[in-house]
Interface confidence: low
């Protein structure tokens, strides 16, 4: 029996309320509303959520009550369309309300903004936060859900419940500690960094489903789950892939109640069948629901079964290859991907998908040839360059990272990517290059066998950030091309880009390089971003500048900031020395 085959319910909203419980129901509705209406004030969302919750309770009491038979999209969409300021705040998004379901929901989805114009979240003093937490714990935690959801409109909702649980635990523990800050700040930093990573990973899953379709997502899932559960049978992996695809399709589609409910069912199924899935699940399956689901999603790869036979027998040497392929193409390719992935935890998922694509292309060509076997006999030889390309790239970049350290490695990537796609906005180039640069500290410490899955799959997540940000305001045909042609070849596509010779350098604007005393009070990270912003602008002005020229100017800039931050009259120093720096930089770069 499929995990998600349920009896029909008279009232979907009552069914989900009963399955999830009031607390999770309210939290998920709040996340859903905040992800759709990202500019609405917190209080407005809370009011809407309370109204939906009260309505759900009437349906629990009597499933035949008025409107209880309506779909969740209809109920939630009707509620969102009651917001008075919809047209003023969201402009054309208000036109969605004139549509019927399912078009209305699709319309809301299309208006989700990956880069909403919202103020940066500033962390208050620890004592202020602890007071707010103690004064009204429920509001404090709701505010957390709201602020994260509106800034990350594709955040994986059931996982956000897990983050909120950890957020609550951190405050519960640390607000009574002797040194509140020492206890709390590392935990909040960890939650922030993990949250950003989780959001970006989920954004790639949604992009995969929405831009490349269910087949692309399923292929990714087959490869990843086969690496993770190499002892599981192909049929078991296929079942998990089908169920996982349903969960992510729901969450990416805004069906958060169904998604959370189905994710819980999937975790239950995995734990009930762990003997036939993986030996690594025992600890996960002893945890409470939210922790359990998270733990399963992050579980380490199981050991590979001993003595797996050669792949060539079934996929190259067998006389039935074309017959098997013709009978059920996707099943046969799925089996190939499963068998290859379970043998190669040392490969990235995207590499495995490239190999599967090459195999598919070869069979398409060869199974129509006069001598199919002769034609595809050497197909595995075609894999060698595909495997070596990411291996060499990772080796070179890890060497560069070890030589430079994270900050300077990021700067090297900033220069590299600005020269490739100089039309992209400076904040996007800085954000993406900084994240690309983090691959060094994240992955280069790993042994060879773990480097590629760590690095290349992480780069896929970061490059997807570039793609979704660029899609909002497309400025570069090269970015559009790399982002849309092939999901699995995005990284090689960007790696292959050379300096854009068609780019007309930006006019020099002294204002871009004018700095003030406020830079002295910034945190280290913020100061790095300021310097990296200046670096991108320099490259946009002088794309042909050499590494040495750029280094000289950046060294002068660092010395200038240090000098003026030590000066008694900082503002005057920044004004006077800044003019000299601009003149010297122009001379050094021949501007």
């Amino acid at each position: 029996r499929g995990v998600f085959r349920r009896d029909a319910h008279k009232s979907e909203v009552a069914h989900r309320f009963k399955d999830l419980g009031e607390e999770n129901f309210k939290a998920l509705v709040l996340i859903a509303f905040a992800q759709y209406l990202q500019q609405c004030p917190f209080e407005d969302h809370v009011k809407l959520v309370n109204e939906v919750t009260e309505f759900a309770k009437t349906c629990v009491a009597d499933e035949s009550a008025e409107n209880c038979d309506k779909s969740l999209h209809t109920l939630f969409g009707d509620k969102l369309c009651t917001v008075a300021t919809l047209r003023e705040t969201y402009g054309e998004m208000a036109d969605c309300c004139a549509k019927q379901e399912p078009e209305r929901n699709e319309c809301f989805l299309q208006h989700k903004d990956d880069n909403p114009n919202l103020p940066r979240l500033v962390r208050p003093e620890v004592d202020v936060m602890c007071t707010a937490f103690h004064d009204n714990e429920e509001t404090f935690l709701k505010k957390y859900l709201y602020e994260i959801a509106r800034r990350h409109p594709y955040f994986y909702a059931p996982e956000l419940l897990f983050f909120a649980k950890r957020y609550k635990a951190a405050f519960t523990e640390c607000c009574q500690a002797a040194d509140k800050a020492a206890c709390l700040l590392p935990k909040l930093d960890e939650l922030r960094d993990e949250g950003k990573a989780s959001s970006a990973k989920q954004r790639l899953k949604c992009a995969s489903l929405q831009k490349f379709g269910e087949r692309a997502f399923k292929a990714w899932a087959v490869a990843r789950l086969s690496q993770r559960f190499p002892k599981a049978e192909f049929a078991e992996v296929s079942k998990l892939v089908t169920d996982l695809t349903k969960v992510h399709t729901e969450c990416c589609h805004g069906d958060l109640l169904e998604c959370a409910d189905d994710r819980a069912d999937l975790a239950k199924y995995i734990c009930e069948n762990q003997d036939s899935i993986s030996s690594k699940l025992k600890e996960c399956c002893e945890k409470p629901l939210l922790e359990k689901s998270h733990c399963i999603a992050e579980v380490e790869n199981d050991e590979m079964p001993a003595d797996l036979p050669s792949l060539a027998a079934d996929f190259v040497e067998s006389k039935d290859v074309c017959k098997n392929y013709a009978e059920a193409k996707d099943v046969f390719l799925g089996m190939f991907l499963y068998e290859y992935a379970r043998r190669h935890p040392d490969y990235s998922v995207v590499l495995l998908l490239r190999l599967a694509k090459t195999y598919e292309t070869t069979l398409e060509k060869c199974c129509a040839a006069a001598d199919p076997h002769e034609c595809y006999a050497k197909v595995f030889d075609e894999f060698k360059p595909l495997v070596e390309e990411p291996q060499n790239l990772i080796k070179q970049n890890c060497e560069l990272f070890e030589q430079l350290g994270e900050y300077k490695f990021q700067n090297a990537l900033l220069v590299r990517y600005t020269k490739k796609v100089p039309q992209v906005s400076t904040p996007t180039l800085v954000e993406v290059s900084r994240n690309l640069g983090k691959v060094g500290s994240k992955c280069c410490k790993h042994p060879e066998a773990k480097r590629m899955p760590c690095a290349e799959d992480y780069l896929s997540v970061v490059l997807n950030q570039l793609c979704v940000l660029h899609e909002k305001t497309p400025v570069s045909d090269r970015v559009t091309k790399c982002c849309t042609e092939s999901l699995v070849n995005r990284r090689p596509c960007f790696s292959a880009l050379e300096v854009d010779e068609t780019y007309v350098p930006k006019e020099f604007n002294a204002e871009t390089f004018t700095f003030h005393a406020d830079i002295c009070t910034l945190s280290e990270k913020e100061r790095q971003i300021k310097k990296q912003t200046a670096l991108v602008e320099l490259v946009k002005h002088k794309p042909k500048a050499t590494k040495e020229q750029l280094k000289a100017v950046m060294d002068d800039f660092a010395a200038f900031v240090e000098k003026c931050c030590k000066a008694d009259d900082k503002e005057t120093c920044f004004a006077e020395e800044g003019k000299k720096l601009v003149a010297a930089s122009q001379a050094a770069l021949g501007l």
């Epitope: 620890v126 004592d127 800050a181 020492a182 590392p186 280290e524």
Partner: nanobody, 115 residues
Framework: QVQLVESGGGLVQAGGSLRLSCAAS????????MSWVRQAPGKGPEWVSA????????RYAESVKGRFTISRDNAKKTLYLQMNSLKPEDTAVYYC????????GSQGTQVTVSS
């Protein structure tokens, strides 16, 4: 359990030097920026100096610039504050914090500068 233990304080003549240490445990020391904060008798906490996670960038309050040097040894999970040309107004309890908080929690180490 996060723990920060300061040491190295003491009584010193004006113009003298001290080196404070802060031993950290219970968290990934190398992943966090650190600060030194001080609290003089009857006054609120005052931020003194900060250093980034890699030990590359450092910052100082105006009152100690040129006299104090912050450093760290990530392998030893230890933060340092070298204090030279000490003045009577540097008398305070010094304690280290994670990030740039001025919330006092650890015991701190007493520095007394006599004239």
């Amino acid at each position: 359990q996060v723990q920060l233990v300061e040491s190295g304080g003491g009584l010193v003549q004006a113009g003298g030097s001290l080196r404070l240490s802060c031993a950290a445990s219970g968290f990934t020391f190398g992943s966090f920026g650190m600060s030194w904060v001080r609290q003089a008798p009857g006054k609120g906490p005052e931020w003194v100096s900060a250093i980034d996670s890699g030990g590359v960038d450092t910052r100082y309050a105006e009152s100690v610039k040129g006299r104090f040097t912050i450093s760290r040894d990530n392998a030893k999970k230890t933060l340092y504050l070298q204090m030279n040309s000490l003045k009577p107004e540097d008398t305070a309890v010094y304690y280290c914090t994670i990030g740039q908080s001025t919330s006092r929690g650890s015991q701190g180490t007493q520095v007394t500068v006599s004239s």
